[in-house]
Interface confidence: low
């Protein structure tokens, strides 16, 4: 960012999307602003219109190509600018030389499904979405389970320190409704952060068999 009151943060999803948020105190109202992406070694450039997400912050997604296309590599640098229109001119409001594989945030895992459920345990699988083949197996996951009467924030985090796209939840209560979420993070990148949480998967454990101890 160009001054202390402005913050310009972007993340690469490892394939063909750069998501950006720009916030600025006292930013001009009713001004058209956009993010412009200018790679150092590619023939393309791309823009997206910044749309308000709060009183003083705007966001947009730079769509670089087909969702699963590998548009950038570990050696690319992309100059990202926030440009705001002032009359007939475009004024540069913020700028960064963006190293995509140092600023990763993957898409949330998808296709969560219950593989097998019992009275006290449940096996759940998922898939990662639009993740670069460069990572090979260098990914980690966090998962959490929402129990009745609790909030997501209270749910303990389960860490999977390898590319393991399933989990076996144990010590569950029979005949109880639960929800499950998972998120993913590459091991690479100084400023890399966790993906958003997946959509919650609701499941119910099987009731205990009549006449049996639980």
């Amino acid at each position: 960012a160009v001054n202390g009151t402005s913050q310009f943060t972007c993340f690469y999803n490892s394939r063909a999307n750069i998501s950006c948020v720009w916030s600025q105190d006292g930013a001009l109202q009713d001004t058209s602003c956009q993010v412009h992406a200018w790679p150092d070694r590619r023939r393309w450039n791309q823009t997206c219109e910044l749309l308000p997400v709060s009183q003083a912050s705007w966001a947009c997604n730079l769509i670089l190509g087909a969702p699963d296309s590998q548009k950038l590599t570990t050696v690319d640098i992309v100059t990202l600018r926030v440009l705001c229109r002032e009359g007939v001119r475009w004024r540069v409001m913020a700028i960064q030389d963006f190293k995509p594989f140092e600023n990763l945030r993957l898409m949330a895992p998808i296709s969560l499904q219950v593989v097998h459920v019992e009275t006290h345990r449940c096996n759940i699988s998922w898939e990662i979405s639009q993740a670069s083949h460069y990572f090979e197996r260098h990914l980690e996951f966090e998962a959490r389970t929402l129990s009745p009467g609790h909030t997501w924030e209270e749910a303990p985090l389960l860490t999977l320190k390898q590319k393991q796209e399933w989990i076996c939840l144990e010590t569950l209560t029979p005949d109880t409704q639960y929800e499950f979420q998972v998120r993913v993070k590459p091991l690479q990148g100084e400023f890399t952060t966790w993906s958003p949480w997946s959509q919650p998967l609701a499941f119910r454990t099987k009731p205990a068999a009549l006449g049996k101890d639980t």
């Epitope: 160009v2 001054n3 100059t79 004024r91 540069v92």
Partner: nanobody
Amino acid sequence: QVQLVESGGGLVQPGGSLRLSCAASGDVFVRYTMAWFRQAPGKEREFVASVTDSGRTTDYVDSVKGRFTVSRDNAKNTVYLQMNNLKPEDTAVYYCAANTDYFQIKSLDRNTWGQGTQVTVSS
């Protein structure tokens, strides 16, 4: 609005070198794409070289390619023009220019200008 002050001009023999500097003040320097122009006696002001706000991308007029190098130091709010293998036809007043619209930096009417510094190449 940014203010620009050039320095480093002078008299130099053909084949010699000079380094021009342009110090900026009054606004956030990194917002500006910077350029050097020159104007020889009786001729129109012409584009010489430009450097984008990040300093990563440069552009030159064909006649100076391989001889001149434009650069900037955003920490010092300064842009430079290193001129090597100078020729008599490089004699001109050299102007520093700034524009927040990097698509318009070659446009004479939309830039902010310094006062210029004289470069004379003569034996």
